[in-house]
Interface confidence: medium
Amino acid sequence: QRLSRAQQQLPLESLGWDIAELQLNHTGPQQDPRLYWQGGPALGRSFLRGPELDKGQLRIRRDGIYMVHIQVTLAICSSTSTSRHHHPTTLAVGICSPASRSISLLRLSFHQGCTIASQRLTPLARGDTLCTNLTGTLLPSRNTDETFFGVQWVRP
């Protein structure tokens, strides 16, 4: 659709085109499977335009249908370690708060690989906080071209 002159002068945030691309900051303390993310121009190619970070977790500020994407590469990994060391390693992305909207959106297992990547379209609401849980004992790489997480507003 074409934008009016007035709309063209508005910041993207006001048009609803919320978007974020994050890089891994750190893993959680013991017994906390969550990955903690960071974003901003000072960090390189990560950014937040609309969504915000709450203690390393991504919080949505605008209702809509979003494309959620994630790639995670294991730093300590091998063709056998994903099955041999302790427990299978699984990545899950979901809405973790508010509790009333808690749901899993993506679930992936590493099996014999060291990298997983996936994306999906899903409705998200203002206040939804997305958590990315890495279960198992293997560690993710913090290389920005190997591990990243983002959302893109697509339509109301």
Epitope: T27, G28, P29, C77, S81, H85, T137, N143
Partner: antibody
Framework: EVQLLESGGGMVQPGGSLRLSCAAS????????MSWVRQAPGKCLEWVSA????????FYAESVEGRFTISRDNSKNTLYLQMNSLRAEDTAVYYC?????????????WGQGTLVTVSS | EIVLTQSPGTLSLSPGERATLSCRAS???????LAWYQQKPGQAPRLLIY???SRATGIPDRFSGSGSGTDFTLTISRLEPEDFAVYYC?????????FGCGTKLEIK
């Protein structure tokens, strides 16, 4: 300045136990994974064990799995290696090494090492 | 496990010469997760190169790394007296982490 200081080495008989310590300073200890690497006299370097920054994830070389236990006390900035059922082939200089950052496996700083001799 | 083979075992050169050290892996090392260390007698290893080609902090630019897959090279463009030592490669893309057995660089 990053400093790693190992202690606890010595002579022990086969089947015995030792506990190595590595006191760390100059960086936020709890934010970094740590490893133990050993070097037998005149031999190659051999990675022994690694532990995540939180202590929640540990990894071992097959040669020591079930006999050695890596741990850390982040409140004391100290890394440990409990070595049980020691064998002659465990004789080596043991280095503690800091990983480049919390989840990344190469070693950017090493201690000076502590010698463990297993002999009857 | 990935076995790293370093060659030559010993390299005899004079200060000012160029040194080329080789590290070959038994299988491909993902993402060029390979590091080089320098070790002098009685000292701990010192990180020189990580990611196959990135110089560690404070390492002079006469040290350079290259390669990918299974073949990696450490080059010292112009040897200084303090460069004579043992050099180890290490892969960190696979568990267990493994080291080569070293190349001894000695003064000719």
């Amino acid at each position: 300045e990053v400093q790693l200081l190992e202690s606890g080495g010595g002579m022990v008989q086969p089947g015995g136990s030792l506990r190595l310590s590595c006191a760390a300073s100059g960086f936020t200890f709890s934010s970094y994974a740590m490893s133990w690497v050993r070097q037998a006299p005149g031999k190659c370097l051999e990675w022994v064990s690694a532990i995540s920054g939180s202590g929640g994830r540990t990894f071992y070389a097959e040669s020591v799995e079930g006999r050695f236990t890596i741990s850390r006390d982040n409140s004391k900035n100290t890394l440990y290696l409990q070595m049980n059922s020691l064998r002659a082939e465990d004789t080596a200089v043991y280095y503690c090494a800091k990983h480049d950052y919390s989840n990344y496996p190469y070693f950017d700083y090493w201690g000076q090492g502590t010698l463990v001799t297993v002999s009857s | 496990e990935i076995v790293l083979t370093q060659s030559p075992g010993t390299l005899s050169l004079s200060p000012g010469e160029r040194a080329t050290l080789s590290c070959r892996a038994s299988q491909s090392i993902r993402s060029s997760y390979l590091a080089w260390y320098q070790q002098k007698p009685g000292q701990a290893p010192r990180l020189l190169i990580y990611g196959a080609s990135s110089r560690a902090t404070g390492i002079p630019d006469r040290f350079s790394g290259s390669g990918s897959g299974t073949d990696f090279t450490l080059t010292i463009s112009r040897l200084e007296p303090e460069d004579f030592a043992v050099y180890y490669c290490q892969q960190y893309g696979d568990l267990p982490f493994t080291f080569g057995c070293g190349t001894k660089l000695e003064i000719k």
